[in-house]
């Protein structure tokens, strides 16, 4: 029997290599059974995850999964960092793994590095 617990399908240690100035959609895939839970995004600041208020978010529905989307319009260098989505379900909080945005500021990059080059430069997180 399928579990009816809410599940948030963000892979552990996942990341996205993106560029400042581009639009980007960060998706939180949500599995639920009857009632869609309330979902929020937060950004990690050390060990604290700070709720993102007043940001453009939307839902996308697919066959057996819903996606809670955080929109970056456009991506800013300050969007660099790790994000987590959380679902409020039956008075419990279910947290996703964090996913990291590696943002390259195109002003300072002579050419766009590849995904693999980005992933091998984790210090970009702290620049």
């Amino acid at each position: 029997k399928e579990s009816c617990d809410v599940q948030l399908y963000i892979k552990r240690q996942s990341y996205h290599s993106i560029f400042a100035g581009d639009p980007f959609k960060l998706e939180c895939p949500v599995k639920y059974c009857a009632h869609r839970p309330q979902v929020t995004w937060c950004k990690l600041n050390g060990t604290t995850c700070v709720k993102l208020e007043g940001r453009h978010t939307s839902w996308k529905q697919e066959k057996n999964l819903s996606f809670f989307i955080l929109h970056f319009e456009p991506v800013l260098p300050s969007d660099n960092g790790s994000y987590r989505c959380s679902a409020n379900f039956l008075s419990a909080i279910i947290e996703s793994h964090s996913t990291t945005l590696y943002v390259t500021d195109v002003k300072s990059a002579s050419e766009r590095p590849s995904k693999d080059e980005m992933a091998s430069r984790p210090w970009l997180l702290y620049s």
């Epitope: 399908y9 892979k11 996942s14 996205h16 290599s17 793994h97 964090s98 693999d116």
Partner: antibody, heavy 119, light 112 residues
Framework: EVQLVQSGAEVKKPGESLKISCKTS????????IHWVRQMPGKGLEWIGR????????KYSPSFQGQVTISADKSISTAYLQLSSLKASDTAMYYC????????????WGQGTLVTVSS | EIVLTQSPGTLSLSPGERATLSCRSS???????????LNWLQQKPGQAPRRLIY???KLDSGIPDRFSGSGSGTDFTLTISRLEPEDFAVYYC?????????FGQGTKLEIK
Amino acid sequence: EVQLVQSGAEVKKPGESLKISCKTSGFNIKDTYIHWVRQMPGKGLEWIGRNDPANGNTKYSPSFQGQVTISADKSISTAYLQLSSLKASDTAMYYCASYEGYYERFGYWGQGTLVTVSS
Amino acid sequence: EIVLTQSPGTLSLSPGERATLSCRSSQSLLDRDGKTYLNWLQQKPGQAPRRLIYLVSKLDSGIPDRFSGSGSGTDFTLTISRLEPEDFAVYYCWQDTHFPYTFGQGTKLEIK
């Protein structure tokens, strides 16, 4: 039935390159990370790197960075390990492993591909 | 990188006995999500490894319950409560908390 079926044994000459495949079935490859692991004759296991078939993102061990290329084609549920400029010291068994990316609820291993590099 | 040190290198026991294998990490394997990503693998001669235990103590599907894992932080143990003939093999611990992921050097469990 869950399966990870790797391509067959290879004998190569130094300087040549090689691409090993790992065909998965019985689960959605997009829900996993595909790892590649080396085992030299009579030795232990060494982690080469990991690919996320959902988006192509790859992480390498510093020991293997620049020597190998890991990739996947999610449309045919197959992962690849490319070895370039082969040396005799690349002679080893190479394994793929598929671990569920969310909660690690499964961890399956391929049968291994024996690569022999000899002049 | 994280160094995993397994002990003993070789363990000689008889069927029916209890086996205790150790894996010590050079740093804590506790991830920031509060979980500890430490696996135990079994490898028999001429075969691929197979996962026995993940997240320190969770038993893989189809693995007999005579296998158990315990520990936290930097010290981990694989216990086989009552050895069966098919348990004699090489056992590896593997951490996938910190990049690059690393394996222990293995413990060979042999028949006494």
